[in-house]
Structure formats: structure tokens, C-alpha cells
């Protein structure tokens, strides 16, 4: 037989807290235990579940756990079944609710001297005890002409007067705990002698020169006084109007009319109602002058076909806030479709080429209307008008490569040379139409060129090979003036290139033949031993079959190269004495001497009184100072060559002679004494 060792028992429970209904069985066979609630099987949930044979509650729920629980044990083999005693929960709970008006039926019916009943909608088990509050202060039974039943949830005020006005709240407690009203009730019972607002003035916005009307009404017994004031507290009456409110009229019903409104009329207007008793009631309303600012400019927009784009129209600042709408081709855009307005935005869904054009954003209010156009371009992928073609360009001449395309907007064209972007410089120029001009074609310009034409919609590209057609030219051009050293061997080179290897020949400009000691060997003029007669004008002629011939004229000078007869020496001079740096050079043509001191050329015309360069080339510095110290370079030059030699100059303090030294003892260095 199945025996219950522990049976569930009825118990107190708290809403939302844990609980356990125990059940333990003993039986010879294998039994399984389940629970019934009001006769129906209990399904396990996270909140309520079987734990062994017992039923565990993670959080008791007053609604779902009310009823009779029973533990059932069943032997599935024999079919024997045993049921426990019934058990139930006494669930304690409390739940907040609002304070509501029970009597009269609506707030509008509350009049002085009528009975008012408020109900506290806090519920619980066991039944709570209630406490009422006005403006946060507890109310006790019989206090100030009210009847309070703490057992009841009702508060009755009989009769209700202005002194009962306030914010009513309630709290309640029971064995579970305490709760206060979730929503309170404001009771307002006016004193009829107090001014009460019937109609309050509203802020108004008017356009300049239009009229503005403020309505204001109070009620009281006896009827209240009504007065209008403008910003500076100046009263406005039909008899005494302030100077800036000449066009103001106060009507018998309290309304204030302002005609032909000006900017100075804008401001705060106060309507004051004063009853026989009570404080004045001040109502304010502002008169705004309508205004609308200019709209910001739109940048032109470029969109690609098929995309979705939005253009936001920033409404201009204005009072009242301007309304905004978009138009295209004079027609207001709808609020849905493929091209439509959404809020302040112009929306173009799946853009088509036909959507291109001018769209206008309009903004308007009482002050007027503003508009701003936006130009929308629908970009297309460029198409070819003329692709770059493989070209043969002549060296030294301008060359052109074309890249003509068309698209919307006008495509931008960039050129690449050997995959490197061509930046415009003195040699490369890209015209507006995309044509590349190479200003002075050089041999190494023979390579691949690629142009890319782009719009926001896409790009196209093409490449072309440039072959440079070499001109017949000297490489390098011979120097037009050259010097040869007398009685020495000399060579004058001349080389040229062309489409075909040129033949090179030297001749004397006077047409006379070259002497036997002068040979012309593959373009190099060779002088075995230069004589005076070798000086003169020579012509190098380069020629080939297809390109003809070119000439270069060279004037050869025979010279005796420069040598120094006298070179300046390392010199030390006492401060205040005179320094002499000697330099003499010889050569033919006769060389000129120049001096360089402290890294600057000494200009004989600007030397000043202390320095002088003699005819023979020597440099004299009088009254030397320490700053004259340094390296001095003698430069000898003629039309044929230039040579230089240098020496340091040291300026030292004159030592004080010691007793042991005789007057004739020499200084330890080469010294010029003057």
C-alpha cells in the first residue's frame, strides 16, 4: 500500500516570496508523484516546479496559486493511487492604486459647499488599514470638518470648501507591508471672490503691419478687475495708451487688439485679473513679429544613375517656423513615389538620367517666402569621341595625343606615362578637351601613354604607344668656342645621331683643307701638335641619306695655358701692420688676376682705403685687423682657362719684448714687418 510519510498542509505565504508544499510517500513498488491544483495537474514552470515529491514555489503568485493543492502518488504497475490531504495558501499581499473621485461623478461638478468623496484604490490581504494625507500632511478623524474612516478606503469631505483644496494622497498597510497611492488627486475648490481664469491670452506671431488680438477673461463674484500691461509695466487703456501703442484697443470683454503692428510692438503683454479677495492672477502672452531669413545656397549635386540620393533643405530661421516643400519644373513634389519629399528632404530613388535638372526648395511663413535652387546632374559614364592612337612624334616638335570623350558632367581626363601620372609642367599640358600636348618631344618620350576619362558614374581608359622620330642632331652640340693648348696634342669631338647613323666630317670654315698633322677620325678632330695657325673657325658636318645634313661651327683659339710665376705664401702679420700677398701669372691671352678673400670675390672698385690690388696682381692690406685673418685665393683667368692658388693670412698681436730677447731675435714664424 502507498503511505504518505509527509503530507502538504495549508500555510500562510507572502506574495512574491518562496514557499514549499511538502509531500513524501512510501510504497513497495515504484511510484510516481504529481500535483493537482483544483483537480487539474500542475505543470512545472520556472516559478513553480516539483522538487523530489514536494512542490516548490520560487515566487508565490496570489492569482495563479490560489486554490487547493493535492499530492497524488501512483503505482504505474498495479494502478494503485493515493491522494494527500488538500492544502492551500493564505497569501498576504498589498498593491498600490490611485486616488479617484467617487462623488460627485466628475471634477466639473465640484462646487463649494457640496460633499466630496475620494476613494483610495490600494488593495490587499489581509484587508489594509488606510491613512489619508493632504499636501503631505496626515488627516485624522473629524479634523477640519471632514470624516475619515480608517477602516474604510473612502475620505468624505462634507461640505467641501476652498480650505479643502490641495493634493490628496493615501497610504495603507497590512501584514504583508505598506503601499501608497500611485496617482494622487488634486482638489481645487475656488473662492468665488478670487479671480479665476476663463480665457488665457495665447502667444501670437503676426506679420508687420498686420493686426494682433489677445483674448483674456476672468470670472469672480463680484466681477473682477482686468488690466493690460506691456513690457515696461505701462498700463494699456483706451484712455491712456503709451506712445508706442497708439493703435491698441481694449474691448469690454477684455480682449486687446493691436493694429498695424510694428517691430517696437513686439514683446510680452500681461493680462492681470484682480478679484475682491485673493492675489492678482497674471497671465502673459508674447507678441512676436513674423520673420524669415534667407536660405543657404545649395552646391550643385552630381548623382549617378540607379542610386538613391537625398538632398536636405535646411529651412531658414523664421517665426513662425517656416513650412518647407520641394518643387521641380514648377510642380510640387509628392510625399511618395520615386522622386518625392520626405520631411525637409528631397528623395530620388533609383535615379534616372531624366531626373537631372533644377529642383527648388521653398520655405514660407507669415513673413514671406524664400526659395533656393539646386542643380542636379545625373552623371553618365564617358563615351569615346576620339581614342588616343599609336603615334609617331617628331623629336623637338610639339606632339599631341587625343583623348576626346563626352559625358555628364564634363569628364575629367588624366594621363599616365609608363603608369606614372603626368603632372602638368613646362613640357606636358592637358587641354580642357583632354588632349595631351608634349611641348618639346624628346627621345625618351617614346613609351606607353594611357588616358583615363572619369565622371562620378565611372571611367573609361585607352592607351597608345608613342614612337619618337629622331631628328638629325649633334649629341652633344660642340661648344662654339674652344681652346687648345699651344704646342700640345688636342682633340675636338663631334658626334651626332639620327634615324640612320650619320657620317661626320670636319672642315675649315674658309673651305681650306685640313693640314696633314690634323686628322678627322670618325668625327673627332685631332691635332698632333697645336700650332698658332690651327686657330680659326671650323665646321662639323653630320649627314645621312634620309635627313640631309647639319652643321656646327666651332671657333678654336690657340692659347698658352696659365701658370703661376709667383704664388701667395702663408703669411703672418702683426695687427695694425701691412700684409702683402703676392701673385703673378702668365699665359696667352694674358691672364687677369682676381682675389677671393673669406669666400667672397674682392671687387677692386669696392675695396676701400685699406686694400689694393697692384697691376702685377699682388694684394696689399694696410692696418690689418684680426678679422682680416683667413684664406686668400688668387684666381688667374683668360678666355681659355682659369687657375687658382691660395694661402692663409694670420693676424697676431705684437708681443711685448722680454729682457732676455735682443731686439734682433726673429719671431718663430714667417713675418712681414713694415
Amino acid at each position: 500500500a502507498i503511505v504518505f510519510i509527509k503530507q502538504p498542509s495549508s500555510q500562510d505565504a507572502l506574495q512574491g516570496r518562496r514557499a514549499l508544499l511538502r509531500c513524501e510517500v512510501e510504497a513497495p513498488g515504484l511510484v510516481h508523484v504529481y500535483w493537482l491544483l483544483d483537480g487539474a495537474p500542475v505543470q512545472d514552470t520556472e516559478r513553480r516546479f516539483t522538487q523530489g515529491s514536494s512542490l516548490s514555489f520560487a515566487a508565490v503568485d496570489r492569482l495563479q496559486d490560489s486554490g487547493t493543492f493535492q499530492c497524488v502518488a501512483r503505482d504505474d504497475v498495479t494502478g494503485e493511487e493515493a491522494r494527500s490531504a488538500n492544502a492551500s495558501f493564505n497569501i498576504k499581499w498589498i498593491e498600490a492604486g490611485p486616488v479617484v473621485l467617487k462623488h460627485p461623478a466628475s471634477e466639473a461638478e465640484i462646487q463649494p459647499q457640496t460633499q466630496v468623496t475620494l476613494r483610495c484604490h490600494i488593495d490587499g490581504h489581509p484587508r489594509p488599514t488606510y491613512q489619508w494625507f493632504r499636501d503631505g500632511t496626515p488627516l485624522s478623524d473629524g479634523q477640519s470638518n471632514n470624516t475619515v474612516s480608517s477602516k474604510e478606503r473612502n475620505l468624505t469631505l462634507r461640505p467641501a470648501g476652498p480650505e479643502h483644496s490641495g493634493l490628496y494622497s493615501c497610504c495603507a498597510h497590512n501584514a504583508f507591508g505598506q503601499a501608497c497611492s500611485s496617482q494622487n488627486f488634486t482638489l481645487s475648490i475656488a473662492d468665488e471672490s478670487f479671480a479665476r481664469v476663463v480665457l488665457a491670452p495665447q502667444d501670437v506671431i503676426v506679420a508687420r503691419n498686420e493686426e494682433a488680438m489677445f483674448h483674456c477673461q476672468f470670472s469672480a463674484q463680484p466681477p473682477p478687475n482686468l488690466q493690460w500691461l506691456f513690457e515696461d509695466e505701462t498700463p494699456i487703456t483706451n484712455r491712456s495708451r503709451p506712445p508706442h501703442l497708439r493703435r491698441a484697443t481694449v474691448f469690454a470683454n477684455g480682449s486687446l487688439l493691436l493694429t498695424q503692428v510694428r517691430p517696437r510692438n513686439a514683446g510680452v503683454y500681461r493680462c492681470i485679473g484682480q478679484g475682491q479677495r485673493g492675489p492678482p492672477v497674471i497671465l502673459e502672452a508674447t507678441l512676436h513679429l513674423a520673420e524669415i531669413e534667407d536660405m543657404p545656397l545649395f552646391e550643385p549635386r552630381v548623382f549617378t544613375a540607379g542610386s538613391e540620393e537625398r538632398v536636405t533643405c535646411l529651412p531658414p530661421k523664421g517665426l513662425p517656423e517656416p513650412s518647407v516643400w520641394w518643387e521641380h519644373a514648377g510642380v510640387r513634389l509628392p510625399t511618395h513615389g520615386r522622386v518625392y519629399q520626405k520631411g525637409h528632404e528631397l528623395v530620388l530613388a533609383s535615379i534616372a538620367e531624366s531626373d537631372a535638372g533644377v529642383y527648388t526648395c521653398h520655405a514660407a511663413n507669415l513673413a514671406g517666402q524664400r526659395r533656393q535652387d539646386v542643380n542636379i546632374t545625373v552623371a553618365t559614364v564617358p563615351t569615346w569621341l576620339k581614342k588616343p592612337q599609336d603615334s609617331q612624334l617628331e623629336e623637338g616638335k610639339p606632339g599631341y595625343l587625343h583623348c576626346l570623350t563626352q559625358a555628364t558632367p564634363k569628364p575629367t581626363v588624366v594621363w599616365y606615362r609608363n603608369q606614372m601620372l603626368i603632372s602638368e609642367d613646362s613640357r606636358f599640358e592637358v587641354f580642357k578637351n583632354g588632349t595631351l600636348r608634349i611641348n618639346n618631344v624628346e627621345v625618351y618620350d617614346g613609351t606607353w601613354y594611357r588616358c583615363v576619362s572619369s565622371t562620378p558614374a565611372g571611367s573609361i581608359e585607352a592607351q597608345a604607344r608613342v614612337q619618337v622620330l629622331e631628328k638629325l642632331k649633334f649629341t652633344p652640340p660642340p661648344q662654339p668656342q674652344q681652346c687648345m693648348e699651344f704646342d700640345k696634342e688636342a682633340t675636338v669631338p663631334c658626334s651626332a645621331t639620327g634615324r640612320e647613323k650619320p657620317t661626320i666630317k670636319w672642315e675649315r670654315a674658309d673651305g681650306s683643307s685640313l693640314p696633314e698633322w690634323v686628322t678627322d677620325n670618325a668625327g673627332t678632330l685631332h691635332f698632333a701638335r697645336v700650332t698658332r695657325d690651327d686657330a680659326g673657325n671650323y665646321t662639323c658636318i653630320a649627314s645621312n641619306g634620309p635627313q640631309g645634313q647639319i652643321r656646327a661651327h666651332v671657333q678654336l683659339t690657340v692659347a698658352v695655358f696659365i701658370t703661376f710665376k709667383v704664388e701667395p705664401e702663408r703669411t703672418t702679420v702683426y695687427q695694425g701692420h701691412t700684409a702683402l700677398l703676392q701673385c703673378e701669372a702668365q699665359g696667352d691671352p694674358k691672364p687677369l688676376i682676381q682675389w677671393k678673400g673669406k669666400d667672397r670675390i674682392l671687387d677692386p672698385t669696392k675695396l676701400g682705403p685699406r686694400m689694393h690690388i697692384f697691376q702685377n696682381g699682388s694684394l696689399v692690406i694696410h692696418d690689418v685687423a684680426p678679422e682680416d685673418s683667413g684664406r686668400y685665393t688668387c684666381i688667374a683667368g683668360n678666355s681659355c682657362n682659369i687657375k687658382h692658388t691660395e694661402a692663409p693670412l694670420y693676424v697676431v698681436d705684437k708681443p711685448v719684448p722680454e729682457e732676455s730677447e735682443g731686439p734682433g731675435s726673429p719671431p718663430p714664424y714667417k713675418m712681414i714687418q713694415t
Epitope: 609617331q392 617628331e394 623629336e395 614612337q467 622620330l469 631628328k471 638629325l472 642632331k473 634615324r499 640612320e500 657620317t503 666630317k505 672642315e507 658636318i541 649627314s543 645621312n544 641619306g545 634620309p546 635627313q547 640631309g548 645634313q549 647639319i550
Partner: antibody, heavy 121, light 107 residues
């Protein structure tokens, strides 16, 4: 004006040689190459070679190599073309032409009036 | 050597006609092509040099165009004195070579 004047017509026996002259005037003779071009009766133009009056350098067409000699005399601004071992196939009008140029390329202008050489036994 | 091929070899046309002669090179010769006119019993006369430059004294009805391997000589309105043989010649490389000629005859 620039002019090239050639020597008169010649009749030669097969195996003989012919020397045609071309006198230049109106420009600096040594500045331009002289080319020789021949035209057989009813045929097209055939290039024979050139001479540089300045250097005396020559360049002959492969076909005439060893049979043609081009010379010049700068003192009388005259160029010569001599063709040896004549055969009847050499019957043609022989033209000299100045080679004008611009450093990139060139063209024949002007041409001599032509010299008819007839080779007949 | 560069081969020059002219077409047609001959053509018949009337005074006032537009005539076009083409010349093709066996390899690219850039723009280095010249055109000559030869009347019977006369030496050739230069018409066009470097493909499109008109020699001074030549009427403007003669125009040349082309580059690379394909070139054309056009006579916009044929005149009686234009009936002759026309030759193209390349001066791109040595040896200079001529086309076989195009004879323009009176129709």
C-alpha cells in the same frame, strides 16, 4: 632660282660607259646632296644613289654597286654620274635631283630636265 | 628595303571630278612620304612633302594625308593640266623608294 641643268642625250654601245653631268645653280652647292634617279621608257622611277657635294661621300643602290660612280667638282658646282658596262636595259632617262630636307626627312626638289641614254648596238 | 604600293595603277576621270590615289608602305614610315607629278616628257615635280605639306606654288586642290603605312593624295576638282602620272616616295630610310605610279587619264 634653284636650278639643275643636265648634259645632253647620249647613244652608247653595249659594254661602254656613260658620264652624265648635272650643274647646280641658285644655292650653296655643298649644302645639299645630289641624288640620281632613272626612268626606263614607260616605266616608273628607280633610285640609283647619292653624293654629298661637301664631303664627296656616296651611297649607291645595291643594284648599281660596282657599276656606278658618282663624283662632284665643287669649283664648278657640278655633279657627275658614270655608269659602266652598259646593256640595253640601261636605256633610260637619267635625272639628277637636289635632296631638300628639314632635319627629320627630305624630298627631291628640284629635278634636272633629264638626260636620255640609249644603249644600242 | 621599304616597298611602296600605289593604287590604282591608272584611273579615268573627267574635269571637275574628285580623285583619290592611295599609297601603302610595307612598314611604318611615320609621315615621311612625298608625292610627285610627272607629265609626259617632263621631270617629276614635287607636290606634297612629309605626307601633308603643300609645296609652294602647288594649287590648293592637291591635299595629302595619312601616317604610318597608309597615305592618300586627293585632287578636289580635276583640271586639264592635272592629267599626268603621280608617284609616291618614302624618305624614312635609305634607300629612298618610289611607288610604281598612278596614271590619271581623261575619260
Amino acid at each position: 632660282q634653284v636650278q639643275l641643268v643636265q648634259s645632253g642625250a647620249e647613244v652608247k654601245k653595249p659594254g661602254a660607259s656613260v658620264k652624265v653631268s648635272c650643274r647646280a645653280s641658285g644655292y650653296t652647292f655643298t649644302d645639299y646632296f645630289i641624288h640620281w634617279v632613272r626612268q626606263a621608257p614607260g616605266q616608273g622611277l628607280e633610285w640609283m644613289g647619292w653624293i654629298s657635294p661637301n664631303s664627296g661621300g656616296t651611297n649607291y643602290a645595291q643594284k648599281f654597286q660596282g657599276r656606278v660612280t658618282m663624283t662632284r667638282d665643287t669649283s664648278i658646282t657640278t655633279a657627275y654620274m658614270e655608269l659602266s658596262s652598259l646593256t640595253s636595259d640601261d636605256t633610260a632617262v637619267y635625272y639628277c635631283a637636289r635632296y631638300d630636307y628639314d632635319g627629320y626627312s627630305g624630298w627631291f626638289d628640284p629635278w634636272g630636265q633629264g638626260t636620255l641614254v640609249t644603249v644600242s648596238s | 628595303d621599304i616597298q611602296m604600293t600605289q593604287s590604282p595603277s591608272s584611273l579615268s576621270a573627267s574635269v571637275g571630278d574628285r580623285v583619290t590615289i592611295t599609297c601603302r608602305a610595307s612598314q611604318s614610315i611615320a609621315i615621311y612620304l612625298n608625292w610627285y607629278q610627272q607629265r609626259p616628257g617632263k621631270p617629276p615635280k614635287l607636290l606634297i612633302f612629309t605626307a601633308s605639306s603643300l609645296q609652294s606654288g602647288v594649287p590648293s586642290r592637291f591635299t595629302g594625308s595619312g601616317s604610318g603605312t597608309d597615305f592618300t593624295l586627293s585632287i578636289s576638282s580635276l583640271q586639264p593640266e592635272d592629267f599626268a602620272t603621280y608617284y609616291c616616295q618614302q624618305s624614312y630610310s635609305t634607300p629612298p623608294t618610289f611607288g610604281q605610279g598612278t596614271k590619271v587619264e581623261i575619260k
